[in-house]
């Protein structure tokens, strides 16, 4: 567990008066339809709120939306609906906020049926001013910004045209027709699939994958017989129909589609799916659905090329295509992921990995909790985490697990303690060491958020009754204070804090309800006076991540290196501040066989760390296609785990084999590829 002085809960001094002086109410004069909230830029304090009240099949005078702007983190709002000419804004497109601190915003308006095209309102000054632009098409999707240049936008039209703007939506050009899906890649590249015959649905599995690197001046066909494609980290994936039957396979490219390799993954049939669960520049977590309507599949982890995959976890819960999976990247500690498995008896259990999918284990039982009715042995059980699947099943779980990169080691989640996830009302648990150990933090379901890089945790009880109390902790959830933020309770709908968990402001959203009137209301609480002083050196202590055995020289080694962090002491009540940067000291570890995965044609027998040749492949031409060409694959049977930084130690060298292979992929070989210019 992370360091913390075990002491009696001390009350934060005079906190009621301090918070009362920093609580700001805003009542919105709106019928309670829907509300959406967007932060514009980082550390700007600018929030846009769009309220809409819309009844289908009612003339436009009745559809109402209002736009509000705050520039002080939600303490005060100004009605700026007149800046968009009191136009009704389409909520299904949301507010398209530009990347980084571009200050750009695009709102898509509702237009009458007979119009030639849609209408957008554009701002490039953090929503201080808007320009109305009539479009030459009706948008089907929200405007998508290029990650590299926020002046470049793309959108699909209702007639499946791909439209691009080079001047932040001022002028639009249709660069291709019959487009199903389009995505920005790196360097302002656009990838998109096209259909030739009937429609996207009819041509599924016969789509072509195209690329343009110059915003539509020229194109290159980089794939045929495409079912779908996806981008993850530096990898471009395509699922491709097989020649002979209705199965499809994943192909991967690391050079923007110029060359492709067939991923060493099982093929899937019509009713199955692939899903990229997580990806970075090193590797990919890929889910492959089981045949039949099982609700589970297998997680595979890739090598650095995205080609060779190791089986990571069996019976991984993932309901249907685009359905629910509990797979969660714990962003507060490197290498940690949490997900759920469906066991043979159809119960759902939580598993955690601390080494990027190398090994999975159950979550340790919290010391202050009893095993529930699902446990066969009342002394031995695990913590099971509620995530997306529980939420989709309408269990009493208001929030998914929460972690933040700058709140090192902290994970907060709803859970139950037993042999499997329970349908009983869950409690809230916290880990301060990235998921190794857990403590019950709050009784019953709550909404929660992290402020000031972990210096404050805020929670609100999940209740069907109106609420007026907020809870907060300055010691990573050990002790809690309660603050009544309003005399008149409100129907609570959500907590909002600036993304990145650096802010000290929290907004409580809800609505008041009186006779035939319900109005949106927000309360923004600034905790700056609770954390009176800036943190100093003495407020921090050294913490070794992934530490399980302090006596061991290799303690804390994960993926070839260990990291020491400076962590805020639990007893310190001070501000990390908006400019807080996580201080960490990495040190390289010696290599062991655990730092290597088995290369293509090799596997690890159970309870053995050595890679041995797969018997069924001995003496066979391998169905393996590297870069779309027949060639020799040279391997020593081992490959360094992606992102592993170990040095020295074990160096698993064995005879280098030439694996003569036959390329059975029918995927584009370079000579089949064609280019064209507009």
């Amino acid at each position: 567990s992370a360091p913390g002085e075990d002491e009696e809960c001390g009350r934060v001094r005079d906190f009621v008066a301090k918070l009362a002086n920093n609580t700001h109410q805003h009542v919105f004069d709106d019928l309670r339809g829907s509300v959406s909230l967007s932060w514009v830029g980082d550390s700007t304090g600018v929030i846009l709120v769009l309220t809409t009240f819309h009844v289908p099949l009612v003339i436009m005078t009745f559809g109402q939306s209002k736009l509000y702007r705050s520039e002080d983190y939600g303490k005060n709002f100004k009605d700026i609906t007149d800046l968009i000419n009191n136009t009704f804004i389409r909520t299904e497109f949301g507010m398209a906020i530009g990347p980084e601190n571009s200050g750009k915003v695009v709102l898509t308006a509702e237009v009458s049926g007979g119009s030639r095209g849609g209408r957008i309102f554009r701002s490039s000054d953090f929503a201080k001013n808007f320009v109305q632009t009539d479009l030459p098409f009706h948008p089907l999707t929200q405007m998508m910004y290029s990650p590299q240049n926020s002046d470049y936008l793309l959108a699909l039209s209702t007639e499946n045209g791909l439209w691009v703007s080079k001047n932040f939506g001022g002028k639009w050009e249709e660069i291709h027709k019959a487009v199903c899906l389009a995505k920005w890649g790196s360097d302002n590249t656009i990838f998109f699939t096209t259909y030739a015959n009937g429609s996207c649905k009819a041509d599924l599995g016969a789509l072509e994958l195209w690329r343009t690197s110059d915003l539509g001046k020229s194109f290159k066909t980089i794939g045929v017989k495409i079912y779908s494609f996806g981008l993850g980290g530096r990898f471009l994936f395509a699922s491709v129909m097989a020649d002979k039957d209705t199965t499809r396979r994943i192909h991967v490219s690391t050079d923007q589609g110029d060359t492709w390799s067939m991923a060493q993954l099982p093929s899937v049939g019509q009713e199955q799916f692939y899903s990229i669960l997580a990806a970075n520049d090193d590797m990919v977590f890929m889910h492959v659905d089981e045949p039949g309507d099982t609700g589970f599949g297998t997680i595979f982890t890739s090598d650095d090329r995205g080609i060779v995959y190791s089986k990571s976890l069996d019976r991984h819960l993932y309901t249907t295509t685009g359905g629910e999976t509990d797979f969660t990247n714990v962003t507060s500690l490197r290498g940690v992921y949490i997900t759920s498995v469906l066991s043979e008896d159809n119960s759902i259990q939580t598993m955690i990995t601390f080494d990027q999918g190398g090994r999975w284990t159950h979550l340790r039982k919290p010391e202050n909790s009893e095993c529930d009715a699902t446990a066969k042995n009342k002394n031995e059980c695990s913590l099971h985490i509620h995530a997306s699947y529980s939420i989709s099943q309408k269990l009493n779980v208001p929030m998914a697990p929460l972690s933040e990169p700058n709140a090192v080691g902290i994970v907060i989640a709803h859970g139950s303690v037993g042999d499997a996830i329970s349908v009983m009302v869950p409690d809230v648990y916290i880990s301060d060491d990235g998921g190794y150990s857990w403590t019950k933090m709050l009784e019953g379901p709550h909404y929660y958020t992290i402020l000031d890089s972990g210096g404050i945790i805020v929670a609100i009880e999940h209740s069907s009754r109106p609420i007026n109390v907020i809870k907060f902790s300055t010691d990573e959830g050990q002790c809690w204070q309660t603050y009544t933020f309003t005399r008149d309770p409100i129907y609570f709908t959500g907590l909002a804090s600036e993304p990145g968990a650096r802010s000290m402001n929290i907004s409580i959203w809800g609505f008041t309800e009186s006779f035939l009137t319900s109005q949106w209301v927000s309360y923004t609480i600034d905790f700056k006076d609770i954390l009176e002083r800036n943190c100093e050196e003495k407020d921090y202590t050294i913490w070794l991540a992934h530490s399980t055995d302090p006596e061991d020289y290799e303690d804390g080694c994960i993926l070839g290196y260990k990291e020491q962090f400076l962590r805020l002491r639990k007893s310190s009540v001070c501000q990390n501040g908006r400019d807080y940067v996580v201080t960490k000291q990495p040190s390289i570890c010696l290599c062991s066989l655990e730092d290597f995965l088995c290369d293509f044609g090799y596997y690890r027998p159970e309870n053995d760390s050595k890679c041995v040749e797969q018997p069924e492949l001995k003496g066979h031409d391998l169905e393996f296609c590297l870069y779309g060409r027949e060639e020799h694959l040279t391997t020593n049977g081992y490959r360094k785990i992606p992102g592993d930084k170990c040095q020295g130690g074990v160096n698993p060298v064995r005879e280098v084999k030439d694996l003569k292979k036959k390329c059975t992929s029918n995927f584009l070989s370079p000579e089949k590829q064609n280019s064209k210019s507009n």
Partner: antibody
Framework: QVQLQESGPGLVKPSQTLSLTCTVS??????????WSWIRQHPGKGLEWIGY???????YYNPSLKSRVTISVDTSKNQFSLKLSSVTAADTAVYYC????????????????WGQGTTVTVSS | DIQMTQSPSSVSASVGDRVTITCRAS??????LAWYQQKPGKAPKLLIY???NLQSGVPSRFSGSGSGTDFTLTISSLQPEDFATYYC??????????FGGGTKVEIK
């Protein structure tokens, strides 16, 4: 398109409790924009508002009926219900459920969707 | 309670006639007023909301005006399908909602 359908017994004995249910189809009762009302109409007479419920469970009743009325909501079934206790012959009427769109500080948006109505007779 | 007084209680008119129905509130109700049409054996149908806004799908020969205490429903050119009873309804800031007594539009 949202539709409302009343259901319940057509005949109730005096002093008993009248129970009706309104089933909402084509939309969610949990939409925070609407108020779910009961209105009745005595034979050959005008319309009388009984009360409404908000999805959160808060209710408002006509003061003239308040002591006898209970309106409840079951969001999981997409239904809301009316109970009127200690009925007499004066409660014989056509009972309608309706969706009320509420009001702002300036405007009232009216009851835009109604059930077809169910006739309840109070008689021994 | 706010009382809604509707007049006339009945009116006889011919196809093509202009028909005006008035509704008076016992105290000011801003634009918290709606108009409904009801045919025998049927549920009421919303015609006008917020005193003057035409509900979607309602013919433009129907119009509403007024605010405060005095409101008017006008049918500019009566059609055969318009013979029905018309009700005004107010929605105040405190309960109850009340309806006017109704105006029956009959064939002359």
């Amino acid at each position: 398109q949202v539709q409302l359908q009343e259901s319940g017994p057509g005949l109730v004995k005096p002093s008993q409790t009248l129970s009706l249910t309104c089933t909402v189809s084509g939309g969610s009762i949990s939409s925070g924009t609407y108020y779910w009302s009961w209105i009745r109409q005595h034979p050959g007479k005008g319309l009388e508002w009984i009360g409404y419920i908000y999805y959160s469970g808060s209710t408002y009743y006509n003061p003239s009926l308040k002591s006898r009325v209970t309106i409840s909501v079951d969001t999981s079934k997409n239904q809301f219900s009316l109970k009127l206790s200690s009925v007499t012959a004066a409660d014989t009427a056509v009972y309608y459920c309706a969706r009320d769109r509420g009001r702002t500080e300036s405007y009232y948006y009216g009851m835009d969707v109604w059930g077809q109505g169910t006739t309840v007779t109070v008689s021994s | 309670d706010i009382q809604m007084t509707q007049s006339p209680s009945s009116v006889s008119a011919s196809v093509g006639d202009r028909v005006t129905i008035t509704c008076r509130a016992s105290q000011g109700i801003s634009s918290w007023l709606a108009w409904y049409q009801q045919k025998p054996g049927k549920a009421p149908k919303l015609l006008i909301y917020a005193a003057s806004n035409l509900q979607s799908g309602v013919p433009s020969r129907f119009s509403g005006s007024g605010s405060g205490t005095d409101f008017t429903l006008t049918i500019s050119s009566l059609q055969p399908e318009d013979f029905a009873t018309y009700y005004c309804q107010q929605a105040p800031s405190v309960p109850p909602i009340t309806f006017g007594g109704g105006t029956k539009v009959e064939i002359k």
